[in-house]
Amino acid sequence: CDLPQTHSLGNRRALILLAQMGRISHFSCLKDRYDFGFPQEVFDGNQFQKAQAISAFHEMIQQTFNLFSTKDSSAAWDETLLDKFYIELFQQLNDLEACVTQEVGVEEIALMNEDSILAVRKYFQRITLYLMGKKYSPCAWEVVRAEIMRSFSFSTNLQKGLRRKD
């Protein structure tokens, strides 16, 4: 499945929106920094399977959508930027949805893909628990925003690689 060029553009637009959403200086939140353990191995360019990567991208965007769709998130960010962010994520989900279905139909996921989806889910579990533990403070949200930007940047680079491999 060829991820359309629009998907890569959408990913970049989502990154720009995430950057614009920042309200606090990252430096004022250094004490709240946390290593969420982004599951880089899932997206390892040397060994990943295409179907696995696409499934993991989808899970990552779906979990990001859910994370930023909460009441606590709505209170933390500018409503207009958040709405634009939702639209970009929704479009990416649609692109990936078509790709996931095309890549493997609706057959059960191979063991490798199971583990990749679980790794992404656990990563977002850590983010969720971190936010709850910090009582959704502005600095906690800033740390999470920066973290999601990093993971999006990583996946954007990988998607370019995916297209080159085609």
Partner: antibody
Framework: QVQLVQSGAEVKKPGASVKVSCKAS????????MHWVRQAPGQGLEWMGE????????IYAQKFQGRVTMTRDTSTSTVYMELSSLRSEDTAVYYC????????????WGQGTLVTVSS | EIVLTQSPATLSLSPGERATLSCSAG???????LYWYQQKPGQAPRLLIY???NLASGIPARFSGSGSGTDFTLTISSLEPEDFAVYYC?????????FGQGTKLEIK
């Protein structure tokens, strides 16, 4: 509020198939994996598998591989669990439960569907 | 498959007493993915504790959870009549997700 409403009780003969439905409301259906858990009379809970309603991908417990099929209909926000080649030990209450993260994991359950397999 | 073994199978106590329920995993479980559920006859399970030690919404403070690795505990500090039920531990740390066989908490 989140609600999961399941189809009614079924009585089936050994060797037959059963299809249980779970209609979701109160949230964005496509955004959360849906799981199926069963409970035989007087027994514990057993995870059967899950489906992502967005693209229909499934992950099944090895025990049910080849016998279970989970599907979804996004137009009606409904997921289905079909179990084939039924045997008496499949007599159980079948639950759908919504995935999520943190306090949302299996925080929402259907009311359960009793499937009785008897000749 | 991670096997979760709960003990005791049945616990007979009186209201006001302290209850300690154990859950032992066959291999290590990430504490973030260890949950506890309560089930009463004829009802679906109800989430009690998520991520080992966090109380779910609406759950009274008499419930608490602890543990790490392979050993986890659910404690009810002072039993109320409505606490008598079956309790299950559950892990989603690795596939297939599993539940313990349950501990039945009954009135002595």
């Amino acid at each position: 509020q989140v609600q999961l409403v399941q189809s009614g009780a079924e009585v089936k003969k050994p060797g037959a198939s059963v299809k249980v439905s779970c209609k979701a409301s109160g949230y964005t259906f496509r955004n959360y994996w849906m799981h199926w858990v069963r409970q035989a009379p007087g027994q514990g809970l057993e995870w059967m598998g899950e489906i992502n309603p967005s693209h229909g991908r499934t992950i099944y417990a090895q025990k049910f591989q080849g016998r279970v099929t989970m599907t979804r209909d996004t137009s009606t926000s409904t997921v289905y669990m079909e179990l084939s080649s039924l045997r008496s030990e499949d007599t159980a209450v079948y639950y759908c439960a919504r995935g999520g993260l943190g306090p949302a994991w299996f925080a929402y359950w259907g009311q359960g569907t009793l499937v009785t397999v008897s000749s | 498959e991670i096997v979760l073994t709960q003990s005791p199978a049945t616990l007979s106590l009186s209201p006001g007493e302290r209850a300690t329920l154990s859950c032992s995993a066959g291999s290590s479980v990430d504490s973030s993915e260890l949950y506890w559920y309560q089930q009463k006859p004829g009802q679906a399970p109800r989430l009690l504790i998520y991520s080992t030690s966090n109380l779910a919404s609406g759950i009274p403070a008499r419930f608490s959870g602890s543990g790490s690795g392979t050993d986890f505990t659910l404690t009810i500090s002072s039993l109320e009549p409505e606490d008598f039920a079956v309790y299950y531990c559950h892990q989603w740390s690795s596939y297939p997700f599993t539940f313990g066989q349950g501990t039945k908490l009954e009135i002595k």
